[in-house]
């Protein structure tokens, strides 16, 4: 029997496999910013370089007794989870430890920043293979810590951070809230969110995925041959850092965007009981548990997409929400969601050379979310076509008029605030293939892309009877790029993508008074990439 | 993920009457002061002064030195603990919170963040 956590994240076909870079040596280096560690432990000796970096605050309390094994406990365990010979995820990986947490597990933002700068300097002085930085720590939201993570990520370093153990929104903590880090929540052996005393794993839109983080067996600093179990989002992050190290060991040229997309795509889906999370966070929290993905050679040129939620706009009348993709990703569609249903739609606009997804609150609304669908589309050329709102009673049509461009998403934005005078926008798949159709007072935005072998089609599913949500999924081999809710209910909450599922949400009151003839339709745009084929629209 | 979280951002654009010094009075602070929303996690007295992205190496040092000089005129001792060159331009400083208004008016300053604790998870 192998430890449950390794069984969970490493599929059977990987168990005996040794991950090696093409030239035969594992050149990936993991930097661990944590407590001091016991480098002589049987799990990690010979694999760990204990750097001379030390930037920690004084321990609290006059009677604090600095006991080496206690000081090393957290870091040693994590080093073992990442690269331990017998209980580690990436057994061959070399690891560098930087001490930024004291014997009580406390550090400072400034100490962490100096540690990150130390890594950057090391990188400049002696460029090496791929670097993974593990940040098994969390503090309150810090603009500068997030900015430092962004700067380091842009140099090609992959940062993995603990979501935090506060049973709270991870966006309120750093570095968990930095978009450029891979943020990891913790699950237990039953794939359920980890409870830690009265608290537990953080959650929300800033979490990228979950990984084992309860009763994780790893190196104990008590003795050089001891093992112990520890729990927390640090352990979960260490698993993902190990997975990333293995991915990079096989394919050293994988970028952060590719790594994140592949982690998400190949994770175990829908096993977490979302009821553990606060109701307002359930839709924002990914239902994903990490597993080691196969190499790109085994999976071919699959179109990979992820959903990125914005922060909540807030309730003011003109409040907007903005969702952004990573620089390497293409924004293929933009939708919006509001719990009250009072929203004025969504659109894509360019800000500083990058296309962003925006959503607008409506008068009396409690606020909106913008929902971006961010995809990896090799050699893509994407553009937005928009048409201002038509006169009353007329439809607005937008299609992709450039040769070989296909429709990947539609957005609709209403000029009027009076929700009663407008009908919902529509997507027409049969009568007008590849068109976005908006009803009165709606500006329509079509996201059009050209990429080698990219083909797309619309898939719709409608429900006439009472239903809180309507869903439609893209079939195997196709990837969801766009998701919209079509006319039917007098009030829809909006639409969003969950993995390959398009979810259209309907307001409770709208359900009650709807006539049977008014179907609410979830419309998905499903695309696939077939590098040998020409870009096309599939009817 | 890119919006500021539960975070305290305080505008400390105080009137610029700094000992009647012309160069100081001319510069009105547009920089902001930020600190952790959780009071128990704050480390008052230690601040990360973050400069504009294009700030040159020499300018970072000059800004830190200028802050020390101006603080000294007011009878305060400032300790520059670290200068950041490689990830972002800025410096870490130990000083009285009384000097925040002064620091925010320095040229090149984008924002100042009070240091705070992070914890093993």
């Amino acid at each position: 029997s192998i430890p449950w956590n390794l069984e969970r994240i490493i599929p059977a076909w990987h168990q005996t496999e040794e991950d090696r870079s093409p030239d035969g040596s594992s050149q990936v280096e993991v930097y661990l910013l944590d407590t001091s560690i016991q480098g002589a432990h049987r799990e990690i000796e010979g694999r760990v370089t204990i750097t001379d970096f030390n930037s920690v605050p004084e321990e609290d309390g006059t009677r604090f007794h600095r006991q080496a094994s206690k000081c090393d406990s957290h870091g040693t365990h994590l080093a073992g989870v990442v690269s331990g010979r017998d209980a580690g995820v990436a057994k061959g990986t070399s690891l560098h430890s930087l001490r930024v947490l004291n014997c009580q597990g406390k550090g400072t933002v400034s100490g962490t920043l100096i540690g990150l700068e130390f890594i950057r300097k090391s990188q400049l002085i002696q460029p090496s293979g791929p670097l993974v930085v593990l940040l098994p720590l969390a503090g309150g939201y810090s603009r500068i810590l997030n900015a430092a993570c962004r700067h380091l990520a842009r140099t090609g370093v992959v940062l993995v951070a603990a979501a935090g153990n506060f049973r709270d929104d991870a966006c309120l903590y750093s570095p968990a809230s930095a978009p450029e880090v891979i943020t990891v929540g913790a699950t237990n052996a039953q794939d359920q969110p980890v409870t830690l005393g009265t608290l537990g794993t953080n959650f929300g839109r800033c979490v990228d995925l979950f990984a084992p983080g309860k009763d994780i067996i790893g190196a104990s600093s008590d003795c050089s041959t001891c093992f112990m179990s520890q729990s927390g989002t640090s352990q979960a992050a260490a698993h993902v850092a190990g997975i990333v190290a293995r991915m990079l060991s096989r394919e050293p040229t994988l970028t952060l965007a590719e790594l994140r997309q592949r982690l998400i795509h190949f994770s175990t889906k829908d096993v977490i009981n979302m009821a553990w999370f606060p109701e307002d966070q359930q839709v924002l929290t990914p239902n994903l548990v990490a597993t080691l993905p196969p190499s790109t050679h085994e999976t071919g040129g699959q179109l990979l997409c992820r959903t990125v939620w914005s922060a909540h706009s807030g309730p003011t009348r003109t409040a907007t929400a903005t969702a952004r993709c990573a620089p390497e990703e293409e924004l293929l569609s933009c939708s919006s969601f509001s719990r009250s249903g009072r929203r004025r739609g969504d659109w894509i606009e360019a800000i500083g050379g990058q296309q962003v997804c925006k959503a607008l609150n409506a008068f009396g609304g409690e606020g909106v979310y913008a929902v971006a669908r961010c995809c990896l589309v090799p050699r893509a050329n994407c553009s937005i076509h928009n048409t201002p709102a038509a006169r009353a009673g007329l439809e607005t049509h937008v299609h992709c008029h450039q040769k070989d461009h296909v429709l990947t998403g539609c957005s609709f934005h209403w000029e009027v605030e009076d929700l009663s005078v407008r009908r919902q926008p529509a997507l027409r798949s049969r009568r007008q293939p590849g068109q976005c159709v908006g009803h009165q007072a709606a500006s329509v935005y079509a996201s059009c892309c050209h990429a080698p072998g990219l083909e797309c089609k619309i898939k719709e599913h409608g429900i006439s009877g009472p239903s809180e949500q309507v869903t439609v999924a893209c079939e195997a081999g196709w990837t969801l790029t766009g998701c919209n809710v079509l006319p039917g209910a007098s009030l829809t909450l909006g639409a969003y993508s969950v993995d390959n599922l398009c979810v259209a949400r309907v307001h409770d009151t709208a359900r009650a008074d709807r006539t049977s003839g008014e179907a609410t339709v979830a419309a998905a745009i499903c695309c696939r990439s077939r590098p040998s084929a020409k870009a096309s629209w599939v009817q | 993920q890119d919006e500021d979280g539960d975070y305290e951002e305080l505008m400390l654009a105080l009137p610029s009457q700094e000992d009647g010094l012309a160069d100081e009075a001319a510069h009105v602070a547009t920089a902001t002061f930020r600190r952790c929303s959780k009071e128990a996690w704050r480390l008052p007295g230690t601040y990360i002064v973050v400069l504009m992205e294009e700030t040159q190496r020499l300018q970072i040092e000059q800004t830190a030195h200028r802050l020390q000089t101006r603080a000294a005129r007011r009878g305060y001792v400032i300790k520059v603990l670290h200068i950041f060159y490689d990830l972002f331009p800025g410096f870490l400083v130990k000083m009285s919170s009384d000097l925040l208004g002064l620091a925010l008016k320095l040229p090149h300053v984008e924002y100042i963040e009070e240091d705070s604790f992070v914890f093993a998870q």
Epitope: S1, D86, I217, D222, T225, C226, F227 | -
Partner: antibody, heavy 126, light 106 residues
């Protein structure tokens, strides 16, 4: 119950390689709960740990012997082996194999040598 | 490496007497210390682990105590089969054994 049995030549020439095998019966060497170790005892002297191995093949050696020791495992035969190269008369000893508990699963537990094989005397002489 | 020093080298006692064996470590081994018994021509047998825990099947007359650097093995009333060599062993930093204490019949 679990039993361990050492086997191999009782006489080795100086500068050659000493080779011993330990056969485990009454239990599986593939258990993730244990490591498997070699310990030696020169005549009339104390005990010295040589090294240990995990079923996965991970090896751990006494730093003073590291350059000369190789321990390997054959899970199909439920055996693990010791090779000690460039032997001298100082390597003359009774060589014991033993189970070192506990390994990775469970994480906590007695991490000691128990049980032991009955030992085999290896004499290094020309 | 951690050096374990056992004393006395030889202890001459009669059956029924109390035996007290000492083991001192060159640095702290916490409670990661074991005691083994070895009879002539036999392999060592685990008596005590983690300083004070009796191994399976070991009679109650054997007890261990101590932590850090000083440890004691006590045999409350010597039986004839208890006359043997006793070794201490640490696992704080890999594995090292003490030089042994021979308990012989007086």
């Amino acid at each position: 119950q679990l039993q361990l049995q050492e086997s191999g030549p009782g006489l080795v020439k100086p500068s050659e390689t000493l080779s011993l095998t330990c056969t485990v019966s009454g239990g599986s060497i593939s258990s993730s709960s244990y490591y498997w170790g070699w310990i030696r005892q020169p005549p009339g002297k104390g005990l010295e740990w040589i090294g240990s191995i995990y079923y996965s093949g991970s090896t751990y050696y006494n730093p003073s012997l590291k350059s000369r020791v190789t321990i390997s495992v054959d899970t199909s035969k439920n055996q693990f082996s010791l090779k000690l190269s460039s032997v001298t008369a100082a390597d003359t000893a009774v060589y014991y194999c033993a189970r070192e508990g506990s390994g990775v699963v469970p994480a906590a537990g007695p991490n000691w040598f128990d049980p032991w094989g009955q030992g085999t005397l290896v004499t290094v002489s020309s | 490496e951690i050096v374990l020093t056992q004393s006395p080298a030889t202890l001459s006692l009669s059956p029924g007497e109390r035996a007290t064996l000492s083991c001192r470590a060159s640095q702290s081994v916490s409670s990661y210390l074991a005691w083994y018994q070895q009879k002539p021509g036999q392999a060592p047998r685990l008596l005590i682990y983690d300083a004070s825990n009796r191994a399976t099947g070991i009679p109650a007359r054997f007890s261990g105590s101590g932590s850090g650097t000083d440890f004691t093995l006590t045999i409350s009333s010597l039986e004839p089969e208890d006359f043997a060599v006793y070794y201490c062993q640490q696992r704080r930093n890999w594995f090292t054994f003490g030089g042994g204490t021979k308990v012989e019949i007086k």
